[in-house]
């Protein structure tokens, strides 16, 4: 992290708390309107690399619900509705931060965790490896 | 959030702290190997809806660096390398959690914030609105 000079108006946190424990206000400030990804757009159906959204739920995690994309096809959908295997549907993945209850079941104690989620799919030209 | 019974081994947090303030250990547990998205795959270049990755930096936020995808074209790239404007490149967006220093410049006090980031692009069939 970036070293930031101590501000006298800040809550105190001693070195003994390393690995660093901080105070986090869970009253979320939302910079955008939160929506179920299925409603936010229909790209998952209109894409040439369409995907399904699967609900991943874990009460020990915050947020407890995460939507995971799974590409419907290995190839990409052409205008005529046929799937073209000269192209590949692949998941676009994003590393996100979540809060994991630690110790488990504790309502007020968390550890930051990075997890990899598939957000949607895109159509790519495959890398073909031929055998000599 | 889901109501979870108080466990006697948990840190204490009184109701006076609402909007709820919790303890978060910033020693991140990584469930996957963290990589620069540019290195993790070359989908951004091989996609029919290619994108560029822009570095968004903010020292008052954790993580301080976020990569934002911007679609290179309005249309989608065909096999011959030309852009097909009968199809559209669109950003796939994901709502993510970040920690915002609050009060500003304080190293140990944060508020959870949701922000919308573009992770990559996908090629979709456009919705055509015909004029009556």
């Amino acid at each position: 992290g970036i070293a930031i000079p101590r501000n006298s108006g800040c809550p105190n946190s001693e070195d003994k708390n390393f690995p660093r424990t901080v105070m986090v206000n869970l009253n979320i400030h939302n910079r955008n309107t939160s929506t179920n990804p299925k409603r936010s757009s229909d790209y998952y159906n209109r894409s040439t690399s369409p995907w399904n959204l699967h609900r991943n739920e874990d009460p020990e995690r915050y947020p407890s619900v995460i939507w995971e994309a799974k590409c419907r096809h290995l190839g990409c959908v052409k205008a005529d509705g046929n799937v073209d295997y000269h192209m590949n549907s692949v998941p676009i993945q994003q590393e996100i931060l979540v809060l994991r209850r630690e110790p488990r079941h504790c309502p007020n104690s968390f550890r930051l965790e990075k997890i990899l989620v598939s957000v949607g799919c895109t159509c790519v030209t495959p890398i073909v490896h031929h055998v000599a | 959030g889901i109501a979870i019974p108080r466990n006697s081994g948990c840190p204490n947090s009184e109701d006076k702290n609402f909007p709820r303030t919790v303890m978060v250990n910033l020693n991140i547990h990584n469930r996957n190997t963290s990589t620069n998205p540019k290195r993790s795959s070359d989908y951004y270049n091989r996609s029919t809806s290619p994108w560029n990755l822009h570095r968004n930096e903010d020292p008052e936020r954790y993580p301080s660096v976020i990569w934002e995808a911007k679609c290179r074209h309005l249309g989608c790239v065909k096999a011959d390398g030309n852009v097909d404007y009968h199809m559209n490149s669109v950003p796939i967006q994901q709502e993510i959690l970040v920690l915002r220093r609050e009060p500003r410049h304080c190293p140990n006090s944060f508020r959870l914030e949701k922000i919308l980031v573009s992770v990559g692009c996908t090629c979709v069939t456009p919705i055509v609105h015909h004029v009556a």
Epitope: N45, N88, P126, H130 | -
Partner: antibody, heavy 118, light 112 residues
């Protein structure tokens, strides 16, 4: 439990067309794809076509001009039409469920035998 | 099309023996998404094929643990640790990474 059952004529004259029906139970066609595969007597398996849950299709390009696949989700049926049959189309024809968009045929019908002969 | 070459075409065994079947593809079966779509099926005499192993090494539900799959890229192997009578039949490898989906010619597992 998951079941698939093929039906179609047992004997067809050369140059004629042929229609198969695969009737399924224990799963929904709106959630799973269905493949057609054939096996000539004493030989190996040849994949023909798949219709995916969203109605999109993938054909074996060698046979695409002679094949047509469709389905009726509400009736739990998949239909395959094959045109211009020749004697080398004599085979056991199977329909099979796709495991999860990964070309894994996890459940198969018992097959329907077709002989092309004059 | 991707050619799948199985060896041997015939494999005589005694009950309780270990059996090994090889499958080689004419091009890599690693998809752009990182997965390898190589599967194994068993067709017992007079029956339709049954899925044994999917994506190289995953046993399908109900498949005994004496069956195992391994390999990567273009070279794959199915092993049966102790052959039982119900294991006799025709084994096919199949790839789904590239269209059209293709099968190997089959390996007949039979008694000595």
């Amino acid at each position: 439990q998951v079941q698939l059952k093929e039906s179609g004529p047992a004997l067809v004259a050369p140059s004629q067309s042929l229609s198969f029906t695969c009737t399924i139970s224990g799963f929904s066609l709106s959630s799973y794809g269905v493949h057609w595969v054939r096996q000539p007597p004493g030989k190996g398996l040849e994949w023909l076509v798949v219709i995916w849950s969203d109605g999109t299709t993938t054909y074996n390009s060698a046979l695409k001009s002679r094949l047509s696949i469709s389905k009726d989700n509400s009736k739990s049926q998949v239909f395959l039409k094959m045109n211009s049959l020749q004697t080398d189309d004599t085979a056991m024809y199977y329909c099979a469920r796709d495991g999860y968009y990964i070309y894994t045929m996890d459940y198969w019908g018992q097959g329907t035998s077709v002989t092309v002969s004059s | 099309d991707v050619v799948m070459t199985q060896t041997p075409l015939s494999l005589p065994v005694s009950l309780g023996d270990q059996a090994s079947i090889s499958c080689r593809s004419s091009q890599s079966l690693v998809h752009s998404n990182g997965n390898t779509y190589l599967h194994w099926y068993l067709q017992r005499p007079g029956q339709s094929p049954k899925l044994l192993i999917y994506k190289v090494s995953n046993r399908f539900s109900g498949v005994p643990d004496r069956f195992s799959g391994s390999g990567s890229g273009t070279d794959f192997t199915l092993k049966i640790s102790r052959v039982e009578a119900e294991d006799l039949g025709l084994y096919f490898c199949s790839q789904g990474t590239h269209a059209p989906l293709t099968f190997g010619a089959g390996t007949k597992l039979e008694l000595n």
